[in-house]
């Protein structure tokens, strides 16, 4: 989201990036602005809709947490050495589901004021591991990912049979983790063929992850990747 300031002084451009946070890790809320040559003239305020106090404030070259809301105490930081070049991004420690929402990055410099909103989604996502299922009676593949939230969809695909629907020959289960939020995802694909690459694709509205496996007579080749969705500029 690109925002422009109003009021007496000139407006400055502030740009945020809609992003996702993985609960139980540190997250980044991205915000950049037209830089100022003097650090002491820059004020950064992070606000969250529905929260009374500030998320974070940085001014005169230092953090000012005197008006910080209780829910963010001990959890936020800006990259102080990068503020001078226009980076107002916020680091958020130990992301929780409740951190989701609409944030505003508000900037004041000697050139003017500006702000932009950011939609922060929170959930859980992890890279799946695909293995040959030794427990199964027939040749099967087992795709396992330890942490997802909200509940994702799981789709199997084959390089050979690209249009195939494997829902009839696969079984997917979701097991709630001990913290009662995230879930372990397990999907088994039956009757697989040797020398074929199979992909286990796990996706929710926050992330998409893929685990590939190719079993031959001599070796097992694996590959995996994770992609965050909806990272669009604002």
């Amino acid at each position: 989201i690109i925002g422009f300031g109003i009021s007496g002084r000139h407006s400055i451009t502030v740009t945020t990036l809609t992003s996702a946070g993985n609960i139980g890790e540190d997250g980044i809320l991205s915000c950049t602005f037209e830089p100022d040559i003097k650090l002491s003239d820059i004020v950064i305020q992070w606000l969250k809709e529905g929260v009374t106090g500030l998320v974070h404030e940085f001014k005169k070259g230092k953090d000012d947490l005197s008006d910080q809301d209780e829910m963010f105490r001990g959890r936020t930081a800006v990259f102080a050495d990068q503020v001078i070049v226009g980076n107002a991004s916020l680091r958020l420690k130990n992301v929780q589901l409740t951190d989701a929402g609409t944030y505003k990055c508000y900037i004041i410099t000697s050139k003017g004021k500006g702000n932009a909103k950011l939609e922060y989604k929170t959930g859980a996502f992890s890279i799946p591991e695909v293995n040959v299922d030794s427990n199964a009676s027939s040749e099967s593949l087992r795709c396992e990912a330890p942490r997802w939230f909200p509940q994702p969809t799981v789709v199997w695909a084959s390089q050979v049979d690209q249009g195939a629907n494997f829902s009839e020959v696969s079984n997917t289960s979701f097991e709630l983790n001990p913290e009662n939020v995230t879930m372990k995802v397990v999907s088994v694909l039956y009757n697989v063929t040797i020398n074929t690459t199979y992909s286990c694709m796990i996706e929710n509205d926050i992330a998409k992850a893929t685990g590939d496996i190719r079993v031959t007579d001599s070796e097992i080749k694996r590959q995996s990747h994770l992609q965050l969705l909806n990272s669009k500029a604002s």
């Epitope: 609960i23 139980g24 890790e25 230092k62 947490l65 001990g74 420690k93 992890s126 001990p178």
Partner: antibody, heavy 115, light 109 residues
Framework: EVQLVESGGGLIQPGGSLRLSCAAS????????MNWVRQAPGKGLEWVSV???????YYADSVKGRVTISRDNSKNTLYLQMNSLRAEDTAVYYC?????????WGQGTTVTVSS | EIVLTQSPGTLSLSPGERATLSCRAS???????LAWYQQKPGQAPRLLIY???SRATGIPDRFSGSGSGTDFTLTISRLEPEDFAVYYC??????????FGQGTKLEIK
């Protein structure tokens, strides 16, 4: 009551291995950043390792490649597997929960590395 | 690597006096990620201050924290006999992930 209880310390020869445990009660280990911090006799506090709620792990340079932090979610317990132990690993080892800071600490377990 | 240097190494004061302990970082540290701990002999550390200035649960109001950037201070306004201990500052968020200062010993004069 929120509590951490360490165990598994003892006297071990240089080059040996040991697994420390930290049993948590009153909160869920897998929802928090869980740390191991050690203190050599008469010295200050030294951070050893952390495991995030997500399972991501980090280590101090002094122990990297020799220790592994892990947890058993079903037992609500944190572990520190220590290999290739050296005399300089002799210390009291504490586990600590980090929410906004390290607000809950165990009583510590003593590891002595000596021949 | 961020190095936290505490001063003085030892502070000798009497009960009722004011104690000022300093923690200086080798580079800027986020105020949110700066904490202070108290440790008594044979005991585990206890969190006193987090976010540079917020008192932890159950900590008396004679303990206060201040500072930002590279300079942080722990102040004990009026020393009680039970306050004589070792105090550590600690930061989070940079490689290594956590760093402690070397400690300040507060002893009875």
């Amino acid at each position: 009551e929120v509590q951490l209880v360490e165990s598994g310390g003892g006297l071990i020869q240089p080059g040996g291995s040991l697994r420390l445990s930290c049993a948590a009660s009153g909160f869920t280990v897998s929802s928090n950043y869980m740390n191991w911090v050690r203190q050599a006799p008469g010295k200050g506090l030294e951070w050893v390792s952390v495991i995030y709620g997500s399972g991501r792990t980090y280590y101090a340079d002094s122990v990297k490649g020799r220790v592994t932090i892990s947890r058993d979610n079903s037992k609500n317990t944190l572990y520190l597997q220590m290999n290739s132990l050296r005399a300089e690993d002799t210390a009291v080892y504490y586990c600590a929960r980090d929410t906004y800071a390290m607000d809950v600490w165990g009583q510590g377990t003593t590891v002595t590395v000596s021949s | 690597e961020i190095v936290l240097t505490q001063s003085p190494g030892t502070l000798s004061l009497s009960p009722g006096e004011r104690a000022t302990l300093s923690c200086r970082a080798s580079q800027s540290v986020s105020s949110s990620y700066l904490a202070w701990y108290q440790q008594k002999p044979g005991q585990a550390p206890r969190l006193l201050i987090y976010g540079a200035s917020s008192r932890a649960t159950g900590i008396p109001d004679r303990f206060s924290g201040s500072g930002s950037g590279t300079d942080f201070t722990l102040t004990i306004s009026r020393l009680e006999p039970e306050d004589f201990a070792v105090y550590y500052c600690q930061q989070y968020g940079s490689s290594p992930m956590y760093t402690f200062g070397q400690g300040t010993k507060l002893e009875i004069k």
